[in-house]
């Protein structure tokens, strides 16, 4: 899980420190998880497609009083510092399924690792 150095970056694209750091933070969260993450709080699942960073931020921001994910919230803000337009928000908020924060983090981590391997840093 922690061996990010093993990810191959295709072509001349330089590795993204921002994506790497986000992955490392999510790895830390999953590995250091003793009690249920954020007391088992539930968040809306998201489509791991275009607009994923903003959607992930919008979902995780609704978990209050959980210091374990505040750094993740702030790191996601780096990818999505300004609100997307009102029209784009409808696609971000497909609010039909709730999952535990721990599962959300694991799903996000797996997807980000895939993006990193493929060199999709933005």
């Amino acid at each position: 899980l922690t061996c990010l150095g093993g990810f191959a970056s295709p072509g001349p694209v330089p590795p993204s420190t921002a994506l790497r750091e986000l992955i490392e933070e999510l790895v830390n969260i999953t590995q250091n998880q003793k009690a249920p993450l954020c007391n088992g709080s539930m968040v809306w699942s998201i489509n791991l497609t275009a607009g994923m960073y903003c959607a992930a931020l919008e979902s995780l921001i609704n978990v209050s009083g959980c210091s374990a994910i505040e750094k993740t919230q702030r790191m996601l803000s780096g990818f999505c510092p300004h609100k997307v337009s009102a029209g784009q928000f409808s696609s971000l908020h497909v609010r039909d399924t709730k999952i535990e924060v721990a599962q959300f983090v694991k799903d996000l981590l797996l997807h980000l690792k895939k993006l990193f391997r493929e060199g999709q840093f933005n």
Epitope: S16, T17, A18, L57, I61, S77, G78, K83
Partner: antibody
Amino acid sequence: EVQLVESGGGLVQPGGSLRLSCAASGFTFSSYAMSWVRQAPGKGLEWVASISTGDTTYYPDSVKGRFTISRDNAKNSLYLQMNSLRAEDTAVYYCARNEGYYFGLTQWGRGTLVTVSS
Amino acid sequence: DIQMTQSPSSLSASVGDRVTITCRASESVDHFGWSLVHWYQQKPGKAPKLLIYRADSLETGVPSRFSGSGSGTDFTLTISSLQPEDFATYYCQQSNEDPWTFGGGTKVEIK
């Protein structure tokens, strides 16, 4: 300790160009969005530009097409290229770490003064 | 653009006083239950400093005498007991809509 140090300000004639720089230290620069905010003499604050970690840029209409924000993560530096400068662009320009619409502008530099005058 | 109107524009107060500054947005700056308003302090010749984010969350390292409240269009920054180092200008800012906009500022002076 987080530090943001702006440079490149000075006197420029209307219609001229200037490039501001911001040197960042004390944090992982490439992992944060960044912004420029300006303050005309004796006036309030005005947001000028932002850039995400993925290099998406954002501008208000007042500078769109004239100003360009960019970053060089290898040099831990943020830039603002200002073209077609007007008298109303005269201000202290601050570089700020932008932690997004939920968290605000969390760290600021001391600013650099840009004066547009003939 | 969303206009942020602060009042008063200036006030005089003494050390130990309770100080309240208000900020009114021209339209709601609430977003899915969060109020996207932030408060900054600026001393003469210095850079602004973030005090409060998301209307009522205290930024790390900021003294607890500062607090924020409000939702929708009306927001308040309160200093429970004014200290000598609190004499400065305070700005509100909204991030609910581009362009991000600031209030005109409230200068807190020594009485």
